[in-house]
Interface confidence: medium
């Protein structure tokens, strides 16, 4: 399933970096979230549960990330113009069933004021 | 699983149009292939098998397409500069298991010579 464009503010700029917000429904217990730039995997985070509800977080492509009960935020630093691109949150839901994949995204525009180190 | 950039010639230009080639492994028997422009679904084709190996082709978002045993080609006509974008082949494999999603893509550059109706 492809959701298309994110219907929330996906990019939050601060201090020459950007927080990319990837939301998921709060009933989702186990999932994989990947951040794609174009078609490339930039970041990858999997949350699963085991015995005694022990949570396991696995990251094959590690990025600075922050996990809440309904979102994963990935942080990109030292922005420059090459960061301008389509970014997608690729969510694979394992639990609850059925298995489902959703892709949401948007274009990251880079303006002068958001660059990390503006030339004075 | 995300494969990222297509490692084959994805865009084939002819007569002011473009053929977008979406490949899949020839062992795949049942699948859904979607063509995405940015994060939007442009085209959608599902191939399934029923009793007696009867093949069923379903298209929710219809585009002119061509199916072979290892690819789906989608055809876009009357190219103009607004067609320039990231295009992704979003393949969902149903059979053989396990269920798997791969995304491959690339940027469609539109040059003067490829436009359908060049201004003279």
């Amino acid at each position: 399933e492809i959701n298309g464009s994110a219907n929330y503010e996906m990019f939050i700029f601060h201090n020459g970096g950007v927080q990319i917000l990837c939301k998921y429904p709060d009933i989702v217990q186990q999932f994989k979230m990947q951040l794609l730039k174009g078609g490339q995997i930039l970041c990858d985070l999997t949350k699963t549960k085991g015995s005694g509800n022990k949570v396991s977080i696995k990251s094959l492509k590690f990025c600075h990330s922050q996990l809440s009960n309904n979102s994963v935020s990935f942080f990109l630093y030292n922005l420059d113009r090459s960061h301008a691109n389509y970014y997608f949150c690729n969510l694979s839901i394992f639990d609850p069933p059925p298995f489902k994949v959703t892709l949401t995204g948007g274009y990251l525009h880079i303006y002068e004021s958001q660059l990390c180190c503006q030339l004075k | 699983e995300i494969n990222g950039s297509a490692n084959y010639e994805m865009f084939i230009f002819h007569n002011g149009g473009v053929q977008i080639l979406c490949k899949y492994p020839d062992i795949v028997q049942q699948f859904k292939m979607q063509l995405l422009k940015g994060g939007q679904i442009l085209c959608d084709l599902t191939k399934t098998k029923g009793s007696g190996n009867k093949v069923s082709i379903k298209s929710l978002k219809f585009c002119h397409s061509q199916l072979s045993n290892n690819s789906v080609s989608f055809f876009l006509y009357n190219l103009d500069r607004s067609h320039a974008n990231y295009y992704f082949c979003n393949l969902s494999i149903f059979d053989p298991p396990p269920f798997k999603v791969t995304l491959t893509g690339g940027y469609l550059h539109i040059y003067e010579s490829q436009l359908c109706c060049q201004l003279k």
Epitope: K32, T48, G50, S56, K58, F94 | P98
Partner: antibody, heavy 124, light 108 residues
């Protein structure tokens, strides 16, 4: 093509030990949680043990807890079951099975790929 | 542990007929963590249905699953010759994960 191949079965006396192995091919092994399921001759299926993608989380059925140990070596695409203090009631065909989603968990997941099974016979 | 009871033990039907298999849990299986497997003699089990009602990949649409809580059913709309086998339900909600004793579907 995905294949799971078990080995290490055989005949052993009560109180003895065996180590079963399951080698996976055609798959990114560390994407998957794995389980062992057994089937006594002419009987139904019984889940024995499960392990998550990196071996950090394991679980066992009450009937084997304290006697069996599940482990994995992702570099070798291999899953293991160390069986100690074997009893006659452990006689069964042992299957290794893979998590359906590729979630890395054995928990809250059904099994899609199974090996063909390896026979363990405990008899004096 | 959650005990699963399957009925009937044996179902004798002819090809083309509809089969309805039942699985009852001793306590509620939350969020539908229930699967159905088919096993033919001398073969490993094959996943048919997961999440109580979702068909696994490559499974024909004559197989369907339904139910929630403690009562679940597997239906085969029109039996094909290759469908005669043993069917197991499996709960993967609570450890230890358990299977039902199986229902054998044989040719009348």
């Amino acid at each position: 093509e995905v294949q799971l191949v078990e080995s290490g079965g055989g005949v052993v006396r009560p109180g003895g030990s065996l180590r079963l192995s399951c080698v996976a091919s055609g798959v990114t092994f560390d994407d998957y949680g794995m389980s062992w399921v057994r089937q006594a001759p002419g009987k139904g299926l019984e889940w024995v043990s499960g392990i998550n993608w990196n071996g950090g989380d394991t679980d066992y059925s009450d009937s084997v807890k304290g006697r069996f140990t599940i482990s994995r070596d992702n570099a070798k695409n291999s899953l293991y079951l160390q069986m100690n203090s074997l009893r006659a009631e452990d006689t069964a065909l042992y299957y290794c099975a893979r998590d359906f989603y590729g979630s890395g968990s054995y928990y809250h997941v059904p099994f899609d790929y199974w090996g063909q099974g390896i026979l363990v016979t405990v008899s004096s | 542990e959650i005990v699963l009871t399957q009925s009937p033990g044996t179902l004798s039907l002819s090809p083309g007929e509809r089969a309805t298999l039942s699985c009852r849990a001793s306590q509620s299986v939350s969020r539908s963590y229930l699967a159905w497997y088919q096993q033919k003699r001398g073969q490993a089990p094959r996943l048919l249905i997961y999440g109580a009602s979702s068909r696994a990949t490559g499974i024909p649409d004559r197989f369907s699953g339904d139910g929630s809580g403690t009562d679940f059913t597997l239906s085969i709309s029109r039996l094909e010759p290759e469908d005669f086998a043993v069917y197991y339900c499996h709960q993967y909600d609570m450890s230890p994960f358990t299977f039902g004793p199986g229902t054998k579907v044989d040719i009348k």
